[in-house]
Every structure is written in C-alpha cells, then in structure tokens.
C-alpha cells in the first residue's frame, strides 16, 4: 500500500488509478495514506473520474476515509440516487490524515479509464464550528496556521483548559450604605468555572440587609444540595446557603456590618444567575427638635449612623453654643445612637451697646437699652459746636450683629467741629488795635517753643501756622507748647495741647525769603470744641470774592504792641487788603531784595501805617467773614513785614492760604 508524503515533507501531490489515463485492470486494490502536520487537514478533489457503476458501488469504487469514518464511496461517472460520483466536490479529512482506497472487481463490462485526483494540506480553521456544535472557545477564538488559541473579554481569565473563560469576580468591596451586586453577565448566563467573592464592608454600627431581586437561576440537582454551582453568604456571625435553583431566597438581615458573598460555578450549564439589592440600617438617633427660631435640614423620617442635620436660624437670629458664636451647625449621628454634639440655640442677634460717639450722644429709639435685631438708635452731635458728617445718625441693628446706617455703613458717624464761629460782630470801619473779648477769636493758638508765635486751629486736631515760626522745632515736635482757649498770654487757665508732628511746606527755604511760609502741626489728641476753642474755616473756592483790595481782614495775636512789648491780652486789628502791585512796589526798594513779595502772598494794612501785625504774631490767622455762610475763614497767615511794624508806606505780608488748599487737604487726609 503506497504511503503518501508525510509531514514535515511538503504535503501535496497527485493520485491516479493504475494505468491512468489508460483503462484500469481487473482485481486491482490500491491504498494511499496521506498525513498532514498537526492542525492541518487534507483537501482532495478529482480532475477525472470514470469507474464502473454498480449498486452501492459494490464492484469498482474509490473510498475516502479519515480515521474510522468513511467520508465517501465513489463510483460511476455521475451521481445517482444511490451512488455517488465526485463531480466537482472537494473532500476534506476530519483530522490530519486521509486514506484513499481504489478497488476493481474481477470484470468490467466495458473499459473504464479510472481517476485522477489532487491533494494538498491546508490549515484547519478550528474556530469555524458546525451549527449546533459547542463553540471552540468561550469568548474569542483566534485561528492560525496549524492551530488556534482562545482569549477572553476584559474581566475574565482563560481557564487552564485553554478554552473556558473564568470571570475575574473577586475582590470587589462595596462600602456605600446601599447598592446592587449580581452574578457576572446578569441577566445573561453566568460564566463557567468561576469563583466569585464579593464583600460588603460598612462602618461599624451598620447592619447589612440583603434582598434577592428580579430572578434567581443557579444550576441545581434534584437529589443533591447545589453540587454544581452555588451561592453562599458569610458574616462574622453565621453562614447562609448554599443557594441554587430557581426560587428567590428570602431577605437576609445579617445584623453585621461586613458580609462576604461567594459564588462558584462549574464547567457546564446555561443559567442566568442572581441579583442582590442591599441596604443597611443602624440604631437611630433621637429625632432632632429644632430650637425656637430655627429649623432642621434635611428633614428625614429617621436619622441613623452617619446621617446628619444642620440648623439654620431665621433672619435676625444667630447660632450660639452658650456664649460662643457659630457660623454653621451640623450634627452627625453616631453608632451608639447619639448625636455628636448638642443642639445650639438660635438667639436673637444682639448688636450690644452702641459705641460712644466722640463729641456726640446716642439715643435709644426702639426702647431704653434695646440693642437686638431691628432695634433703632439715633446718634447726634453736640449742638452749636459740632455737626454730623455724611450720614443722618440713624442706625439699625442688622442680622450680622452690627449697627448699620441707612447708607450701609458700620462705622460710627463723625461729629466734625463747626468752624468759623465768633462772638464778634464786625462793623465796616477800621479802628486801632483792640483787646479781644472771650469768644472773639476762638481759633487763636499760642505757640511757645523758643519764641512766641501763633497759629489757628483747624478741625479739632490740626494747627495752621507759618513755617518760619516752627522751623526750629520741625524735628522735635514735642518741644512745642501749644495753648488755646485763653485770652491772657500768661494765664494759667488754658487748654494744653501737644504736637505729634510738624509738616513744613516743602517749598519753604529758611532764611531765604518767605515764599511758601506755611506749616501744619498735628496734635496728639483732639481738643474739645466750645465757645472759646473753635476751628477756623478754610477758604472756599469762592472765597477770593471776600478778599479783594480794600476788603477788611482781622489779624489777632499777642505780638509786640506800640509800646514794644508782647501783649498780655490777645489783641486784634482790622486792616484792609492792599493792592498786590502796590505792595510789591513797596518792598522793591532796599533793604528788601527784588521779588520779596510773591504770588503766594497777600498784603494788608494802612498806607498811613499804625495798624499792623508784629513780631510774636507770626503764624496767626488773618481772617475774613464769608457773608454767604456767615462763617470766618483764614485768608492769610502772619508771615513778614517791615522792620518797624505799622510803618507808613509799608504793609504786613501774609501767606495766601487759598493757594495751599490742596497741600493742606493732602496732609490732613494722609496723616
């Protein structure tokens, strides 16, 4: 019996009946055995076929076998109802070997030419399976020359049998208070040869409840308890199961915070599995009763471990734990069924006693001493000498606990001193130096510190003066002895003030003329305003209209009098403003250097002399009455003049204050 080629030789070739293409002889028997490599099969087809036809091919035939199975018995030229000729059919071995047998009997009625066939080895596609046959692989089948291999979807691993996909279904831990878990692929059939472990692990104090839902279908056996596939539930207290079959197991109240669910499957079966919905419970905490004027959120039927609530107070009420304020309050239910903190109170907001208003007073409007939410108070300033700045003084206790003005300000109103008040009434005429009376010049300040000088009170904590008067003390402000509220220079009865800082105009050069002869002294404390101590006003923009040539200004001070001594009593003189050109010309001739009188100066006095300020008056104010506001304002600061005070043809020279308003305002606002 001829053998066909065997692997690893190339497996292909030709087979033919003896004597082909001539007729074959009687009583012939020829057998070929073809062998292909593992994972390959043999393909065979006929290019010529002419054998004697007989019933069931009993006489002459070609038989194709693969292992124990006969693939075909062939005879004739064309197929009939009971006999088969190959025609254009192709034949395939079942494995890697194919046996071909040719036989002729003792006679032929006529000559037959036999057969010619060709064969070749080809790869078996193990992944192709006939309908109704089990698939080669559980999930994915991959064919290759000479073989195949299986692989699995994500979440599965190939079993050691190399075909089955076992689920990777262990190690899942559920920590939420409720959830769902199910067999892999549920509700589709669960995988074979799998061992799944699920854990529910909640915080101590919780108890897990298991409910089987929808459907339950786990392979079972009529006599033996769950021998194939099974579900088991284990807690630290007890084990439940095994479960299998088609009946939903009852609810399981585990009374445990940890549960392990085990699901094991074998290699056979087609079942949909199971689904569990789990919840948890715990010892409830006492129902929270909201404090008066507060509410609980969220509102729940019950509160168990880890549940929380917050307290929110009505507008105008605040959270307090005793005396301690809280912005927010949240309590959490603990495992022993108690809240982690006590309930706070929602207390009405109390703004507390309002702050005292310097130079003012406060009045309770809602009721005596009422300082709670929506209470109203009214601030007012001491009449005559103070006026309220910016707001109307009405404040309400708001929900944030602060007294708040109608403009939304939480700061106190400011009682600003009224400026420019004087007891003096002026006539239009000029007369000689006179003694001042109480209240005539309440802005007058006496400055002692090396020499005697003067100044004028601005607001309640600034003094306006001449730069030359305080130049020596600019670095030692505390050396200045500042007195006010007195007429007599040497009187022990005065209001004492001390300097915190001296600000000399940066354009002033000492001993080089008197341009920019202006300075400000900041007092270290505010002074109390009264009829004898009142600030002078600064000039308004429109003030120039009251300071034209021949308009009357008043200078006051304790400077030298005609007798050559410092005045004991405060003196004043009414003097007219002098034309600027006239004044400039008066000081052009020697001994005065050219340009002595600048645009930053104004002059006042009589051409005939006799009325003037003098040494000791330096820094004092030359004041004018604003007839529209009926307030006095400072137009000039006593600066310089002729060597002989009150000399005819010479005038007192004053720093022109209106030129320095921005400078004054900047310093006061900055410091």
């Amino acid at each position: 019996t001829p053998l066909g080629p065997k692997w690893p030789e190339p497996v292909f070739g030709r087979l033919a009946s003896p004597g082909f293409p001539g007729e074959y002889a009687n009583d012939q028997e020829r057998r070929w055995t073809l062998t292909a490599p593992p994972g390959y099969r043999l393909r065979l087809y006929f290019t010529h076929f002419d054998l004697e036809l007989s019933h069931l091919c009993e006489y002459d035939f070609v038989k194709l076998s693969s292992g124990a199975k006969v693939l075909a018995t062939l005879c004739g030229q064309e197929s009939t109802d009971t006999e088969r000729a190959p025609g254009k059919d192709t034949f395939y071995s079942l494995g890697s070997s194919l046996d071909i047998t040719f036989r002729s009997d003792y006679s032929n009625e006529k000559p037959f030419t036999g057969f010619e066939a060709f064969y070749a080895a080809e790869d078996i596609d193990e992944c192709q399976v006939a309908p109704g046959e089990a698939p080669t692989c559980d999930h994915h089948c991959h064919n290759h020359l000479g073989g195949f291999y299986c692989s699995c979807r994500a979440g599965y691993v190939l079993h050691r049998n190399k075909r089955t996909c076992s689920a990777l279904c262990s190690g899942q831990v559920f920590t939420q208070r409720s959830g769902e878990l199910s067999s892999p692929e549920y509700p589709r059939p669960y995988p074979k040869l799998s061992s799944c472990t699920y854990s529910i692990s909640l915080e101590e104090g919780f108890s897990v409840i298991l409910d089987f839902v929808e459907s339950f279908d786990v392979e079972t056996h009529p006599e033996t308890l769950c021998p194939y596939d099974f579900l088991k539930i284990q807690t630290d207290r007890e084990e439940h199961g095994p479960f299998c079959g088609k009946t939903l197991p009852h609810r399981i109240e585990t009374k445990s915070n940890t549960v392990t669910i085990t699901f094991v499957t074998d290699e056979s079966g087609d079942h949909t599995g199971w689904k569990i919905h789990y919840t948890s419970t715990a010892q409830p905490c006492p129902y929270p009763m909201a404090p008066p004027n507060g509410h609980v959120s969220p509102v729940q039927a019950k509160y168990i471990l880890k549940d929380s609530f917050s307290i929110f107070c009505e507008t105008g009420y605040e959270l307090l734990q005793g005396h301690l304020p809280l912005k927010s309050f949240t309590a959490v239910c603990q495992k022993d069924g108690s809240w982690d903190r006590p309930m706070p109170a929602c207390s009405i907001v109390d703004c507390g006693p309002p702050d005292d208003l310097p130079s003012g007073r406060v009045e309770y409007i809602t009721g005596p001493g009422v300082t709670t939410y929506k209470a109203v108070i009214q601030y007012s300033c001491e009449e005559t000498f103070y006026t309220m700045k910016v707001n109307d003084g009405k404040y309400v206790c708001e929900a944030d606990g602060f007294w708040t003005s109608s403009k939304g300000e939480k700061s106190l109103p400011v009682c600003e001193p009224v400026c420019g008040l004087s007891a003096r009434t002026t006539g239009g005429r000029i007369y000689g130096g006179q003694k001042a009376k109480p209240g005539d010049f309440p802005w007058q300040v006496l400055i002692l510190g090396g020499t005697t000088a003067a100044g004028a009170l601005l607001y309640d904590n600034w003094v306006l003066t001449a730069a030359h008067a305080v130049y020596e003390q600019k670095h030692d402000a505390s050396a200045l002895d500042i007195r006010m509220g007195t007429l007599k220079r040497l009187s022990p009865h005065y209001t004492q003030a001390w300097s915190e800082a001296v600000f000399i105009h940066e354009g002033y050069t000492h001993d080089a003329g008197f341009d920019n002869d202006i300075a400000l002294i900041k007092l270290n404390n505010k002074v109390v305003i009264n009829s004898n101590i009142t600030p002078i006003c600064l000039p308004r923009k429109e003030a120039e209209s009251f300071m034209r040539t021949d308009d009357i200004g008043t200078a006051s001070g304790w400077g030298l009098t005609q007798r050559g001594f410092l005045a004991r009593n405060l003196m004043y003189v009414d003097i007219p403003i002098v034309d600027h050109q006239k004044c400039t010309a008066a000081y052009e001739k020697p001994p005065y250097p050219r340009g002595s009188v600048t645009a930053n100066m104004l002059c006042a006095g009589l051409e005939s002399g006799g009325k003037d300020s003098c040494r000791g008056d330096s820094g004092g104010a030359l004041v004018f009455l604003d007839s529209e506001t009926e307030r006095w304002f400072v137009g000039g600061i006593v600066s310089w003049g002729s060597m002989n005070c009150g000399e005819a043809g010479q005038y007192g020279v004053y720093t022109k204050v209106i030129n320095y308003i921005p400078w004054i305002e900047n310093i006061i606002s900055d410091f």
Epitope: G322, H323, K327, G401
Partner: antibody
Framework: DVQLQESGPGLVKPSQSLSLTCTVT?????????WNWIRQFPGNKLEWMGY???????SYNPSLKSRISITRDTSKNQFFLQLNSVTTEDTATYYC???????????WGQGTSVTVSS | IVMTQSQKFMSTSVGDRVSVTCKAS??????VAWYQQKPGQSPKALIY???YRYSGVPDRFTGSGSGTDFTLTISNVQSEDLAEYFC????????FGSGTKLELK
C-alpha cells in the same frame, strides 16, 4: 492642621498699652468660630479676656471692657489684643485660642509671657 | 458666673478612679468644657458640652452633669494623666474654674 501663634513684646511698662498678635494658619478666621484671648496668671489661674467672632463681632470680659480691644486683619489671618493702662497685675502668659464649644476641636497657641514692670 | 473647683489638689494612684468636681454659681445648662494642662504646655481640651468627649481623647475620661454641678471622672488613672484640670463655663461670657491638680499619692 489649625495652628495659632502669639507674638508681641515680653515687657511692657505700667500705664502703657499691651499689644499682641495671634497668627492663625490652617484655617480662616472668617470661616467660623470665636477667636479668643485668654491669660494665665502666675499661680495658674485662667481668665478669659474676650473674643472676636468669624463675623468680626467682639465680646469682652466685663471686668476688662473699659481697656480691652480685639481687632483682626483678615488679609493676614491675624487677630490682635490691645490692653490699655496696664499694671503689674496684668503680668501673665497670654494665649490665643479657637473655641467652638465642641464644634470642631479647640486649638490654643503655645502662649507668650508678658511682664509689666518699670 | 463663678466656677468653683473646691479641691485644689487630689492624690491618686495609677489604676485608680478619680472624680474632679466643678460647681457653677448659677445655671449654665450643659455649656461646660474640661481642660487638662501639663507644666509648660497649653491647656488641652478633653470634654465639651459637659459630657461629650473630643476625638482622640481616651475613653477613660468621662464628663457628666448639668445646671450647676459638673464632674470629670478618670477611670483607671495613668501616669500621663497627672496634670492640672480646669473646668470652663461658656454659657454666659466665659469663666474658668481655679483648677485641680492631680498628683500621685
């Protein structure tokens, strides 16, 4: 973690003002709670001086009300103590502390010793 | 409100149970805290709202009381518990007790 740190002069002259700063890290003083000043006298007696709340409102020990002021600088997360007209009786260790009556932990600074002496 | 800790010193032994008391001059509800202070250290909060233990505080420390009478109990005293204990009321303003020093017999 919340931390409080007191700072200020260790020596103050009688009749002057005592000024201390408490710097808070790890929590904003405007978020919640009362931010307190507490002092401990030699002999260990503790005295609450006052607080400034998360909203900026203050509460003072009535015995100190006329001379105490507690303020804050929210941009620096600091609050301050000013005690005026001090005497030798004000010699103590001064603590700043976050107190919440159980709402959140209580946190104290490590304390700063202040001596009032001429 | 005055908080009175009548015992300035208390002697105890390791393993003992000891109770520190505090009396308020008027009703303070449960707005009382307890503090432990060791030499050279700041006070450390133990108990709030009379009976609630701060997290991290050993459960051998227990607070009780309401109204005017309050107690801090230490069961199974440990050597590290030897310190001074202060009560604080925060019902109306804040007032501390004068302190009770726990020492070894």
């Amino acid at each position: 973690d919340v931390q409080l740190q007191e700072s200020g002069p260790g020596l103050v002259k009688p009749s002057q003002s005592l000024s201390l700063t408490c710097t808070v890290t790890g929590y904003s003083i405007t978020s919640d709670y009362a931010w307190n000043w507490i002092r401990q006298f030699p002999g260990n007696k503790l005295e609450w001086m006052g607080y400034i709340s998360y909203s900026g409102r203050t509460s003072y020990n009535p015995s100190l009300k006329s001379r105490i002021s507690i303020t804050r600088d929210t941009s620096k997360n600091q609050f301050f103590l000013q005690l005026n007209s001090v005497t030798t009786e004000d010699t103590a260790t001064y603590y700043c502390a976050k107190l919440g009556g159980g709402h959140g932990m209580d946190y104290w600074g490590q304390g700063t010793s202040v001596t009032v002496s001429s | 409100i005055v908080m009175t800790q009548s015992q300035k010193f208390m002697s105890t032994s390791v393993g003992d149970r000891v109770s520190v008391t505090c009396k308020a001059s008027q009703n303070v509800d449960t707005n009382v805290a307890w503090y432990q202070q060791k030499p050279g250290q700041s006070p450390k909060a133990l108990i709030y709202s009379a009976s609630y233990r701060y997290s991290g505080v050993p459960d051998r420390f227990t607070g009780s009381g309401s109204g005017t009478d309050f107690t801090l109990t230490i069961s199974n005293v440990q050597s590290e518990d030897l310190a001074e204990y202060f009560c604080l009321q925060y019902n109306s303003y804040l007032t501390f007790g004068s302190g009770t020093k726990l020492e070894l017999k």
